[in-house]
Interface confidence: low
């Protein structure tokens, strides 16, 4: 039985050219997190955080993705093409896999007011 829940930053908006933090937290379980995968809307992997091996940022994103804070991910130099869904996948022992969803909307600088909130999807 999987008892945990993933809390995410939910729906967020950020300015073009700026940066944004994507954050997921696993709670209500004592399962050990062995790996966290971060994927983009087209299911391409942005980064992996393995508990034993540390961070691996995929080459296509090395210029614009920074690890952290914590198990989160920081996207930098945002473009309009970054708008879309992002997924955190928590691989845990013994529970199995938990998945969280974040929707990022990148807005023209004149429009956006950076917003983020924690929510349980």
């Amino acid at each position: 039985m999987m008892t945990g829940t993933i809390e995410t930053t939910g729906n967020i908006s950020a300015k073009k050219g700026g940066s944004v933090i994507l954050q997921c937290h696993l709670s209500s379980t004592m399962a050990q997190v062995t790996q966290v995968n971060w994927e983009q809307h087209d299911h391409s992997l942005l980064a992996i955080r393995n508990a034993e091996l540390g961070w691996h940022i995929y080459p296509a994103f090395k210029d614009r993705v920074a690890p952290g804070p914590g198990l989160g991910l920081t996207l930098q130099s945002l473009t309009m093409n970054d708008t879309g869904e992002y997924f955190c996948t928590y691989h845990t022992y013994p529970d199995g896999t938990y998945r969280g969803r974040i929707f990022l909307e990148v807005l023209e600088s004149s429009v956006a007011e950076h917003s983020a909130r924690f929510q349980i999807p």
């Epitope: 039985m1 999987m2 008892t3 937290h25 709670s27 209500s28 379980t29 004592m30 399962a31 050990q32 997190v33 062995t34 508990a51 540390g54 914590g70 198990l71 022992y93 013994p94 529970d95």
Partner: antibody, heavy 117, light 106 residues
Framework: EVQLQQSGPELVKPGASVKISCKAS????????MHWVKQSLGKSLEWIGY????????GYSQKFKSKVTLTVDRSSRTAYMDLRSLTSEDSAVFYC??????????WGQGTLVTVSA | QIVLTQSPAIMSASPGEKVTMTCSAS?????MHWYQQKSGTSPKRWIY???KLASGVPARFSGSVSGTSYSLTISSMEAEDAATYYC?????????FGAGTKLELK
């Protein structure tokens, strides 16, 4: 090298409280939960609960819920266990143990708590 | 809560003898782990994920499962194997230990 260094032995009076510490080194502290285990003299091991080293979330065995509070201080890489309303039944060795994929690969050296008037 | 019943509680074996101890789970568990503990010391992870030997554990040790009955076997007893062995399961938010099997040298 992973090490869990626990605080020293405690002699406490019935009804009192005690706080045991477990200082971690040799790994990324916030990546692993810290668990606590009780072993009464000549008896088996009993799981008390865990604390999430990243966000402080806790989970307790039903038996210990009213007896124990688990906390963590990320800055000093230390986990704590508060035991309250102590009785002779609480006299035991208490271990901290680091969570990992296959059970508890790393244990502290244990802290002996003796409850006596 | 899943109950783990270890048997026998106490056993003795001569050097070179094959030793088997069991841990029976009251219901299905994900994996079983085994710990070795000698008097006055902390437990050591001995076998994990049912059948994997922890670092430094001699190859004479093995772990297996049949249904909900888990076994730790020593192919040829040695003096240093005298200790208490505990099984432990971890299934979601339930974590329990068995009462232990004390293995003595005959």
């Amino acid at each position: 090298e992973v090490q869990l260094q626990q605080s020293g032995p405690e002699l406490v009076k019935p009804g009192a409280s005690v706080k045991i510490s477990c200082k971690a080194s040799g790994y990324t502290f916030t990546d692993y939960n810290m668990h606590w285990v009780k072993q009464s003299l000549g008896k088996s091991l009993e799981w008390i609960g865990y604390v999430n080293s990243f966000n402080g979330n806790t989970g307790y065995s039903q038996k210990f819920k009213s007896k124990v509070t688990l906390t963590v201080d990320r800055s000093s890489r230390t986990a704590y266990m508060d035991l309250r309303s102590l009785t002779s039944e609480d006299s035991a060795v208490f271990y901290c143990a680091r969570s990992s994929r296959g059970g508890f690969a790393y244990w502290g050296q244990g802290t002996l708590v003796t409850v006596s008037a | 809560q899943i109950v783990l019943t270890q048997s026998p509680a106490i056993m003795s074996a001569s050097p070179g003898e094959k030793v088997t101890m069991t841990c029976s789970a009251s219901s299905s568990v994900s994996y079983m782990h085994w710990y070795q503990q000698k008097s006055g010391t902390s437990p050591k992870r001995w076998i994990y994920d049912t059948s994997k030997l922890a670092s430094g554990v001699p190859a004479r040790f093995s772990g297996s499962v049949s249904g909900t009955s888990y076994s730790l076997t020593i192919s040829s007893m040695e003096a240093e194997d005298a200790a208490t062995y505990y099984c432990q399961q971890w299934s979601s938010n339930s974590l329990t230990f068995g009462a232990g099997t004390k293995l003595e040298l005959k």
